[in-house]
């Protein structure tokens, strides 16, 4: 014998108190699949969370984080603070990058400057807390006897030092 509740579509629930009639989900609740005996309470995006998608009778609300924070965890269950460029987020808050490292993002960790000499190149632009060094021509190319100067090589992908 077929379960009468299986006919109840998403957005409704099978109401045992009313002879298993399919009743619409009450306000601030939803059912995302058919045949449900209850509707789930909608997620509320409060405080540091803000609403990315409103709850409907068939789908839960979706939250993201207010400016200055970014999502972590499944379905944005947490908001982690952004840091400034030139900083990294540690367990004890935002800390400035140590000398010789940089971070050009508002999240993630500080990474070492590229070592230009490993590629036989010179430093064209010094690194900062916010930016990697820019490698230029090799010192040999700049020596007085060199016949031509090769154009500066494009900067290496930030933080990816040669293996």
């Amino acid at each position: 014998l077929q379960d009468p509740c299986s006919n109840c579509p998403a957005g409704t629930f099978c109401d045992n108190n009313r002879n298993q009639i399919c009743s619409p989900c009450p306000p601030n609740s939803f059912s995302s699949a058919g045949g449900q005996r209850t509707c789930d309470i909608c997620r509320q995006c409060k405080g540091v969370f803000r609403t990315r998608k409103e709850c409907s009778s068939t789908s839960n609300a979706e939250c993201d984080c207010t400016p200055g924070f970014h999502c972590l965890g499944a379905g944005c269950s947490m908001c982690e603070q952004d840091c400034k460029q030139g900083q990294e987020l540690t367990k004890k808050g935002c800390k400035d990058c140590c000398f010789g490292t940089f971070n050009d993002q508002k999240r993630g960790i500080c990474r070492p400057w590229t070592n230009c000499s490993l590629d036989g190149k010179s430093v064209l632009v010094n690194g900062t807390k916010e930016r990697d060094v820019v490698c230029g021509p090799s010192p040999a190319d700049l020596s007085p006897g060199a016949s031509s100067v090769t154009p500066p090589a494009p900067a290496r992908e930030p933080g990816h030092s040669p293996q």
Partner: nanobody, 124 residues
Framework: EVQLLESGGGLIQPGGSLRLSCAAS????????MTWVRQAPGKGLEWVST????????YYADSVKGRFTISRDNSKNTLYLQMNSLRAEDTAVYFC?????????????????WGQGTTVTVSS
């Protein structure tokens, strides 16, 4: 599938105690450091405590030092947070998290798996 399931949250009066648990499955529990973090209403994540895989090394945020104790039972694949002398400012959702190394650190987050959280409300 790696899973972390917190329990033990609830409503408690200031000065009271609670013990949170985090049941872990799907990985070799003793091989990884574990961490508790919390998120108070309207605020960002705050690190609470970290324990090494063996349980030998523990670290605490200054805000909970002397009041909270992190521990683990590797035979039961369970992480604990004993919270004493609770204050209103401890009100938060508490998340347990797996780090991707056995070594505990009080500097970097090395978290690769999060639990769903358990709510602790401290109010009279």
């Amino acid at each position: 599938e790696v899973q972390l399931l917190e329990s033990g949250g609830g409503l408690i009066q200031p000065g009271g105690s609670l013990r949170l648990s985090c049941a872990a499955s799907g990985f070799t529990f003793s091989s990884f450091a574990m961490t508790w973090v919390r998120q108070a209403p309207g605020k960002g994540l705050e690190w609470v405590s970290t324990i090494s895989g063996s349980g030998d090394n523990t670290y605490y945020a200054d805000s909970v030092k002397g009041r909270f104790t992190i521990s683990r039972d590797n035979s039961k694949n369970t992480l604990y947070l004993q919270m004493n002398s609770l204050r209103a400012e401890d009100t938060a959702v508490y998340f347990c998290a797996k780090e991707d190394t056995a070594v505990a650190s009080d500097y970097y987050y090395n978290i690769d798996v999060w639990g769903q959280g358990t709510t602790v409300t401290v109010s009279s």
